[in-house]
């Protein structure tokens, strides 16, 4: 799990806009974006 | 260990398609898929991805909600495509993180 | 939204030579570091070669190398062979962005 600032902010932010069980979200947190960069 | 995607052909404008990312031979929670698409001769375009671990999503803003990523299964993620136009045309790809990559499949949206 | 710009869009290079592509973010990437370079065959899907910027991916040739940070980047093959015939795109992650993900044009390398 990711726990820093900004993994935090980013799940807030996703569950803020939870649709239908599914996050609209366009900040890929650091524990995704950076496995793949 | 594999990625590979299946779905595509040939669709209407204005229809709708749904992509399926098959993975083998890894951990699936552990990971993030991606989706990146090509469009003929063009370059890659991120379209989303979705982690795995929790099955949050996250999408670039051109989608606009007319594509959405699922996990269906504990090896396959879905990519529903709706509101197809001519301009999404494209080998759709599903990645591991990036670093293990599916053949693609290809979606021709064409009347 | 994070813009990557990749340059030259095609480079001829004889085999044996040195080939540079450059990589250029409109913003810092994640860590400073947060880029990948991938090698596309026509008919194939991408492979990625190089990830934190210079982190050589498992079973990739040496001759393969990134440097870089921040928001200037770029892959060095050093002694060119036939079979580096391919385009190479690089992409590039920041996290407090939306569209914090995106991917440059593309390089196409032919060996001569």
């Known amino acids: 799990a990711c726990d820093t600032a900004t993994c935090v902010t980013h799940r807030l932010a996703g569950l803020l806009s939870r649709s239908g069980g599914v996050v609209k979200n366009n900040f890929v947190p650091t524990n995704v974006g950076s496995k793949a960069f | 260990q594999s990625v590979e995607e299946s779905g595509g052909g040939l669709v209407q404008p204005e229809g709708s398609l749904t992509l399926t990312c098959t993975a083998s031979g890894f951990d699936f929670s552990s990971n993030a898929m991606w989706w990146v698409r090509q469009a003929p001769g063009k370059g890659l375009e991120w379209i989303g991805c979705i982690y795995n671990g929790d099955g949050s999503t996250y999408y670039a803003s051109w989608v606009n909600g007319r594509f959405s990523i699922s996990k269906t299964s504990s090896t396959t993620v879905t990519l529903q495509l709706n509101s197809l136009t001519v301009a999404d045309t494209a080998t759709y790809y599903c990645?591991?993180?990036?670093?293990?990559w599916g053949p693609g499949t290809l979606v021709t949206v064409s009347s | 939204a994070i813009v990557m710009t990749q340059t030259p869009s095609s480079k001829s290079v004889p085999v044996g030579d040195t080939v540079t592509i450059n990589c250029q973010a409109s913003e810092s990437l994640y860590n400073n570091n947060a880029l990948a370079w991938f090698q596309q065959k026509p008919g194939q899907p991408p492979k990625r070669l190089i990830y934190?910027?210079?982190k050589l991916a498992s079973g990739v040739p040496s001759r393969f190398s990134g440097g870089g940070s921040g928001t200037q980047f770029t892959l060095t093959i050093s002694g060119v062979q036939c079979d580096d015939a391919a385009t190479y795109y690089c992409g590039g992650y920041r996290s407090d962005s939306v569209d914090g993900v995106a991917f440059a044009g593309g390089t196409e390398v032919v060996v001569k």
């Open positions: 990645a591991r993180d990036l670093d293990l």
């Open positions: 934190d910027a210079s």
